[in-house]
């Protein structure tokens, strides 16, 4: 069953129903809810059937409503129960107020019920013009608001309403007057110089958008120069202006269309730079130092230009930093007068020129470079030189091929001659020679030298002379050639030259087959790329034949003799006796004896038979002349 | 009847290449040693280059050292000169020359003309 | 140049001229003479001590004393005017070197 339908008001635009029904499963609630003077269709809802209470929302204000309330179960309508109820009267707005009031913004605060309206409404018009109102609309739950963007000095409407889906309320206003806006604080000038000057002012904080400087020479009416920079700048450098000149410079802020009272200051530029006191002293004989004054200002850089008094087309310019005072000017002319002018240069101004003259000292002198006494390994120089002004000479010993390491020497300023030694042989050199004294080095001066060429071909050596031959030896730089050519002509020249070539590599040849004991000459000559080096000579004689002689007989038995000889001492290295009858009956006797061997007992023979008997000596493979004798055995 | 005659002349451009040959008749040319000499427009002679029988040996003046190449090949009678990165002062007549070996160059080439000019 | 010789000589026709060469090597090896006519190759003419190649007039000679070798024209003839080179070695490094050149005028 359902029952107790009770009805109470939810706010000005909403209801609450409640009823009770027996705990059966209802299958859902149909709610009817009609205006009780039926002007508009009624509104219907079905609730699930668990539900015993609901909060009708979206309705008018002080409207009487008849709400019915009906159940389904399982198809069946439960009896409608009814009740009438009257929705509240609609919320109006509290107190609107100006909580703070600025030159361009003010801030509203507002009461109103909580939660009675979606948004808020606001208007703000000027007081006094037909101008189109600026409107915004804040969310419901806000109490207070900032208006920004005003006028400064303007009078100013302020309209609020709440809003609901379907209600607005009745409107709250308020007057209210926007403040002036705020004046600037100091203008200054902290720097000052001759072509430019910095400003510095005050003012609060984040209030400009920017500032407009005039800059206006006082005296002139030439068009002002403007500047304008951002808000948030306090200094700002104004360059470009003219040395030694009045100017007034004016300031103003501009915030949204409105602009301060001018701020303004006068002030007078620096006098240009000027450059004082050029100096020019001399640095030795190809030199001079500048010294000037100048105001610590930004020089960017100095202009120097050095000119021959005499000759006014070649000038020197040279470009110096800016932080310079001095500079020494080297590479001139000895003994010459020249002209010098400086200017400086600060952001593209020149200043006036200085000028001032000096010469330069007298050269010292040296000259004469002499080489002498050249050997295959060194050379003596000998120069001359102005007195007592130098301190060392400098002697540079560089190989014209540039195939060596350069050599450098420091010599005393009071030497007038040095010795070159340690050097190549056959090698060009070129000697440069400078001397230096305190602060100058006079300009070099070169000669040239060749180290003489070491014989590439030397000491011819004969060795090991024998009767038939013997060594030819010699001695040759390395690599040097391609061949050597050995001739070997006897004394007499009666028989023809012997001519025997080499590699360049060997260094000696063994002759053999040579005329025992005669004169031979022997000539050694070296070839380059076909080229013949004089040759070498020596003349040698070869030894006489080893010689065995004085064969004797002796102590003759009847089956044998002895034989004794003589023979050149240390030559033989063995003997060969040869022993027959001289009718030729036997065969021969052939022995063999050792070199120290002089005589040997022949045994072993016939009695009373004559035989002949040969000597001869073997040296080196060779046999010597030989010698013969008869000897007859005795009787037996 | 001794005969050698070049060929490969011609003008080049400063740092160019050229390559010069030599063809040799009437003489046993494995048996002699070769040699280059050139003579600049109006000036003396100026040994180049020099090759031994076999190759194996080559020897160069200072002033063409690591720009120029002597070679040879027996079996055609030729020999060669390869010559890199050409200057100015390489505009000459070249010529072949051979030599025995106990006597310098005997006999020559009538030669050919190199100029680097661009 | 390593080997010096003079720019000109001249000789009159049929009498005797000199040509020198001097040079650090000539003290160590015998020069080498060239004769060269305009627009021809180099012919040698005398080599070694004194040693003439076939088909050189016997005119020609050579000689060497210290570090100058000469070359003689015993009887200048019309046809011996030409330019003549010495030639020598200067040891490996400097294999093959020439003089500078002497124009022979026979007048």
């Known amino acids: 069953e359902l029952e107790n339908l009770t009805v109470t008001e939810v706010g000005w635009d909403g209801l609450r129903l409640n009823w009770t029904a027996a705990d059966q499963a209802y299958e859902h609630f149909i709610i009817q809810v009609q205006e009780a003077n039926k002007v508009e269709a009624a509104r219907n809802l079905t609730v699930p059937g668990s539900l015993r209470a609901v909060d009708i929302p979206g309705l008018k204000a002080a409207t009487p409503y008849t709400v019915s309330i009906y159940g389904v179960i399982q198809g069946y309508r439960t009896p409608v129960l009814s009740a009438e109820a009257s929705t509240g009267e609609t919320p109006n707005l509290g107190e609107v107020v100006v909580a703070e009031v600025g030159w361009d913004a003010l801030k509203l605060n507002w009461t109103a019920p909580e939660g009675a309206y979606e948004y808020f409404f606001i208007q703000v018009q000027e007081a006094d013009t037909v101008e189109a109102a600026q409107n915004l609309t804040v969310p419901g739950g806000l109490r207070s608001t900032d208006l920004p963007g005003l006028k400064a000095a303007t009078h100013y409407t302020i309209t609020i309403r709440g809003v609901t889906q379907d209600f607005s309320t009745t409107p709250l206003s308020v007057e209210v007057l926007t403040e002036e806006v705020p004046d600037m604080g100091n203008l200054t000038v902290t720097e000052v110089s001759w072509d430019a000057l910095r400003l510095n002012w005050t003012t609060p904080d984040g209030t400009y958008d920017q500032f407009t400087i005039q800059v206006q020479e006082a005296d002139q009416v030439e068009e002002a120069h403007n500047l304008t920079v951002p808000g948030s700048l306090r200094s700002m450098e104004i360059p470009g202006l003219r040395a030694g000149t009045p100017y007034t410079v004016t300031l103003h802020g501009e915030v949204r269309g409105h602009s301060t009272r001018p701020l303004a200051v006068e002030v007078v530029t620096e006098d240009l730079p000027q450059l004082g006191d050029l100096a020019v002293s001399e640095v030795g004989w190809d030199g001079l130092r500048l010294n000037w004054t100048a105001a610590d200002n930004a020089y960017e850089h100095f202009v120097i230009q050095v000119q021959e008094v005499n000759k006014v087309e070649a000038a020197q310019n040279l470009t110096l930093p800016g932080s310079l005072r001095a500079v020494d000017i080297p590479g001139l002319e000895a003994a010459t007068p020249y002209r010098v002018s400086i200017y400086g240069v600060i952001r593209g101004y020149r200043t006036p020129v200085l000028s001032a003259e000096a010469s330069t000292a007298k050269e010292p002198e040296i000259g004469n470079l002499n080489v002498s006494d050249i050997t295959p390994e060194s050379f003596n120089l000998s120069w001359m030189a102005t007195d007592g002004i130098f301190e060392t000479f400098t002697i540079e010993i560089i190989d014209s091929n540039r195939l060596l390491e350069t050599v450098e020497y420091n010599i005393s300023g009071a030497e007038r001659t040095a010795h070159i030694s340690g050097l190549p042989p056959s090698t060009d050199f070129i000697v440069y020679l400078s001397g230096l004294a305190p602060s100058i080095r006079t300009k070099t001066i070169s000669a040239t030298a060749t180290t003489e060429a070491l014989p590439l071909l030397e000491n011819l050596t004969i060795s090991d002379i024998n009767p038939y031959g013997f060594t030819v030896s010699w001695m040759a730089s390395e690599n040097a050639f391609d061949s050597f050519l050995v001739t070997v002509v006897d004394s007499g020249k009666l028989l023809d030259p012997q001519e025997f070539t080499l590699s360049g590599t060997q260094r000696k040849l063994e002759l053999r087959g040579l005329i025992t004991g005669i004169g031979y000459e022997v000539m050694v000559s070296g070839f380059t790329q076909g080229h013949q080096t004089k040759p070498l000579r020596a003349e040698i004689v070869t030894e006489a034949e080893p010689e065995v002689d004085n064969l004797l007989v002796s102590d003759a038995t009847p089956d044998g003799f002895r034989l004794s000889w003589t023979a050149d001492e240390g030559v033989f290295d063995n003997f060969v006796l040869k022993i027959r009858d001289t009718k030729k009956q036997s065969e021969p006797l052939e022995i063999t004896l050792l070199a120290p061997e002089r005589t040997r007992d022949i045994t072993g023979l016939r009695e009373a038979t004559e035989y002949e008997i040969e000597l001869y000596g073997i040296s080196k493979g060779r046999r010597s002349q030989t010698v013969s004798a008869i000897a007859t055995t005795a009787m037996g | 009847e001794v005969q050698l005659l070049e060929s490969g002349g011609g003008l080049v451009q400063p740092g160019g290449s050229l390559r010069l040959s030599c063809a040799a008749s009437?003489?046993?040319?494995?048996?002699?040693?070769m040699g280059w000499v050139r003579q600049a427009p109006g000036k003396g002679l100026e040994w180049v280059s020099a090759?031994?029988?076999?190759?194996?040996?080559?020897y160069y003046a200072d002033s063409v050292k690591g720009r120029f190449t002597i070679s040879r090949d027996n079996s055609k009678n030729t020999l060669y000169l390869q010559m890199n990165s050409l200057r100015a002062e390489d505009t000459a007549v070249y010529y072949c020359?051979?030599?025995?070996?106990?006597?310098?160059?005997?006999?020559w080439g009538q030669g050919t003309l190199v100029t680097v000019s661009s | 140049s390593e080997l010096t010789q003079d720019p000109a000589v001249s000789v009159a026709l049929g009498q005797t001229v000199r040509i020198t060469c001097q040079g650090d090597?000539?003290?160590?090896?015998?020069a080498s003479w060239y004769q060269q006519k305009p627009g021809q190759a180099p012919v040698l003419v005398i080599y070694?001590?004194?040693n003439r190649p076939s088909g050189i007039p016997d005119r020609f000679s050579g000689s060497s004393s210290g570090n100058t070798a000469s070359l003689t024209i015993t009887g200048a003839q019309a046809e011996d005017e030409a330019d003549y080179y010495c030639?020598?070695?200067?040891?490996?490094?400097?294999?093959?070197?020439f003089g500078g050149g002497t124009k022979l005028t026979v007048l």
């Open positions: 020359a051979k030599h025995p070996p106990h006597r310098p160059f005997d006999y």
């Open positions: 009437g003489f046993t040319f494995s048996g002699s040693r």
């Open positions: 090759i031994n029988e076999e190759g194996g040996q080559t």
């Open positions: 090597s000539l003290r160590s090896y015998y």
């Open positions: 070694g001590k004194n």
């Open positions: 030639n020598s070695s200067h040891g490996p490094r400097r294999p093959v070197v």
